[in-house]
C-alpha cells in the first residue's frame, strides 16, 4: 500500500484527502494542514513547509479546524437582551448563552439574540412542557381531569384536587380546572344553598 501523503502535498484535482483537517492552497496547488480548534494560522504553508498554527489569545476563539489568520473575539451574553451565560468563552468555543429564567428566545440569527418574557397561562391551564427550556413561548394546555391551577402565571403547574377523605373530611364543593375541592368537617351542616342537595 502507498504511504499516506503528509501535508504539504501536491493535488492536481484541487481536493484534499482529509477535508476536515486539510485545505487546498490554489497558489501552489498543494494541500496544507488546517489549524485545530483553539488556534489560527500564524504562517501560511508553502511547497516545502506546512501551515504554522498559534494558540488564540485570551478572549478569542476558533471553533473548527480552520485556515483563518485571526481568531474570533468572544462576545459576552447580553443581559439587556435577556441572556445569561451558561459556559464561558474558551479558545475553542464561543460564550454559551441562554435565556434568563422566565424568558424564551424570540429572535434567532445562528444563535439566540433576543429573549422575551414567557406569556402567562391563565387559570385552568398550564404551560406545556418543552424539550428545551427557553426555546419557545408558552403553549398553554388545559389542566387534565382531577387537576386545577388558580393563577395567571408563566410557570405554575396544575395540581391534583385535594381528596377530602384522605384528611378525614367530606367534600363541600367539587374541584374545577380553576379551583381546588372544598372540604368540610363531616359534622358541619351544609351551607343553606346546598341543603337541597343534602335531601337528595
Amino acid at each position: 500500500s502507498q504511504p499516506q501523503a503528509v501535508p504539504p502535498y501536491a493535488s492536481e484535482n484541487q481536493t484534499c484527502r482529509d477535508q476536515e483537517k486539510e485545505y487546498y492552497e490554489p497558489q501552489h496547488r498543494i494541500c496544507c494542514s488546517r489549524c485545530p480548534p483553539g488556534t489560527y494560522v500564524s504562517a501560511k504553508c508553502s511547497r516545502i513547509r506546512d501551515t504554522v498554527c498559534a494558540t488564540c489569545a485570551e478572549n478569542s476563539y476558533n471553533e473548527h479546524w480552520n485556515y483563518l489568520t485571526i481568531c474570533q473575539l468572544c462576545r459576552p451574553c447580553d443581559p439587556v437582551m435577556g441572556l445569561e451565560e451558561i459556559a464561558p468563552c474558551t479558545s475553542k468555543r464561543k460564550t454559551q448563552c441562554r435565556c434568563q429564567p422566565g424568558m424564551f428566545c424570540a429572535a434567532w440569527a445562528l444563535e439566540c439574540t433576543h429573549c422575551e418574557l414567557l406569556s402567562d397561562c391563565p387559570p385552568g391551564t398550564e404551560a406545556e412542557l418543552k424539550d428545551e427550556v427557553g426555546k419557545g413561548n408558552n403553549h398553554c394546555v388545559p389542566c387534565k381531569a382531577g387537576h386545577f391551577q388558580n393563577t395567571s402565571s408563566p410557570s405554575a403547574r396544575c395540581q391534583p384536587h385535594t381528596r377530602c377523605e384522605n384528611q378525614g373530611l367530606v367534600e363541600a364543593a367539587p374541584g374545577t380546572a380553576q379551583s381546588d375541592t372544598t372540604c368540610k368537617n363531616p359534622l358541619e351542616p351544609l351551607p343553606p344553598e346546598m341543603s337541597g342537595t343534602m335531601l337528595m
Partner: antibody
C-alpha cells in the same frame, strides 16, 4: 403601527435635573429592550443608555454614568431618563429608540430638545 | 471602547450615481454593524442591520457588505430623496458607538 413619543425636554440650568419620558404604542412594550440616543446641535449621534424589557439590566455611556438613570414602567408602556447634574455638553435632542436583537435601533421617536444653559 | 470611522465625511453626487460609504471599526465586530439615514430635523431611520440585511420597507438600491472591521454602504442609483446624512453603528458591545456621519449632498 409602532410609535414612540418623547416629552419632558426644555431649558434647565447647569447642575439642574430633568426627567424625559417616552410613551410607546403599537407593540408589546415589555418584550423589547429600549434605549436613549442623543444628538448635540450640528453633531453626530451618541448612544446614552439601554434597558432590558423587564427593566432588570441597564448600560450607560461613560459620559452620563452616575448622573443619568434609565427606567421603565411596563404597565404604562413608558420609558424614562432621569438626568441629574446636567452640564452644558448634555445639550442635545434626545431620542428614544426600540433596541432590537442587541444590535440595532429599529424604531425611533421624533426627539425632545434638552438645553442646559445659564 | 470601539471607535467607528466613516469615510468620506461628506460627498457630492448626482441623481443616478452609484455611491459607496465606508465604515471601519477599531476592532473586529463580526457582522454587528448597522446603517442609518437621517434627514435634517428628523429622527434617524434604519436602513441595513447585521452588515448586509435590508430593513423592511427600505428600497433595494441600498445594500451593505463587510465583516470584521471593514464595511460599506452602497446606493446603486441615487434618487433625490437619498440626499441625507448616513451613520454606521456597531452593536458588538457596550458602549454602542456610531460613526461621525457622512453627509451626502447634491452635486
Amino acid at each position: 403601527e409602532v410609535q414612540l413619543l418623547e416629552s419632558g425636554g426644555g431649558l434647565v440650568q447647569p447642575g439642574g435635573s430633568l426627567r424625559l419620558s417616552c410613551a410607546a404604542s403599537g407593540f408589546t412594550f415589555s418584550s423589547y429592550a429600549m434605549s436613549w440616543v442623543r444628538q448635540a446641535p450640528g453633531k453626530g449621534l451618541e448612544w446614552v443608555s439601554a434597558i432590558s424589557g423587564s427593566g432588570g439590566s441597564t448600560y450607560y455611556a461613560d459620559s452620563v454614568k452616575g448622573r443619568f438613570t434609565i427606567s421603565r414602567d411596563n404597565s404604562k408602556n413608558t420609558l424614562y431618563l432621569q438626568m441629574n447634574s446636567l452640564r452644558a455638553e448634555d445639550t442635545a435632542v434626545y431620542y428614544c429608540a426600540r433596541y432590537y436583537w442587541g444590535w440595532y435601533f429599529d424604531y425611533w421617536g421624533q426627539g425632545t430638545l434638552v438645553t442646559v444653559s445659564s | 471602547d470601539i471607535q467607528m470611522t466613516q469615510s468620506p465625511s461628506s460627498l457630492s453626487a448626482s441623481v443616478g450615481d452609484r455611491v459607496t460609504i465606508t465604515c471601519r471599526a477599531s476592532q473586529s465586530i463580526s457582522s454587528y454593524l448597522n446603517w442609518y439615514q437621517q434627514k435634517p430635523g428628523k429622527a434617524p431611520k434604519l436602513l441595513i442591520y447585521a452588515a448586509s440585511s435590508l430593513q423592511s420597507g427600505v428600497p433595494s438600491r441600498f445594500s451593505g457588505s463587510g465583516s470584521g472591521t471593514d464595511f460599506t454602504l452602497t446606493i446603486s442609483s441615487l434618487q433625490p430623496e437619498d440626499f441625507a446624512t448616513y451613520y454606521c453603528q456597531q452593536g458588538w458591545w457596550y458602549p454602542l458607538t456610531f460613526g461621525q456621519g457622512t453627509k451626502l449632498e447634491i452635486k
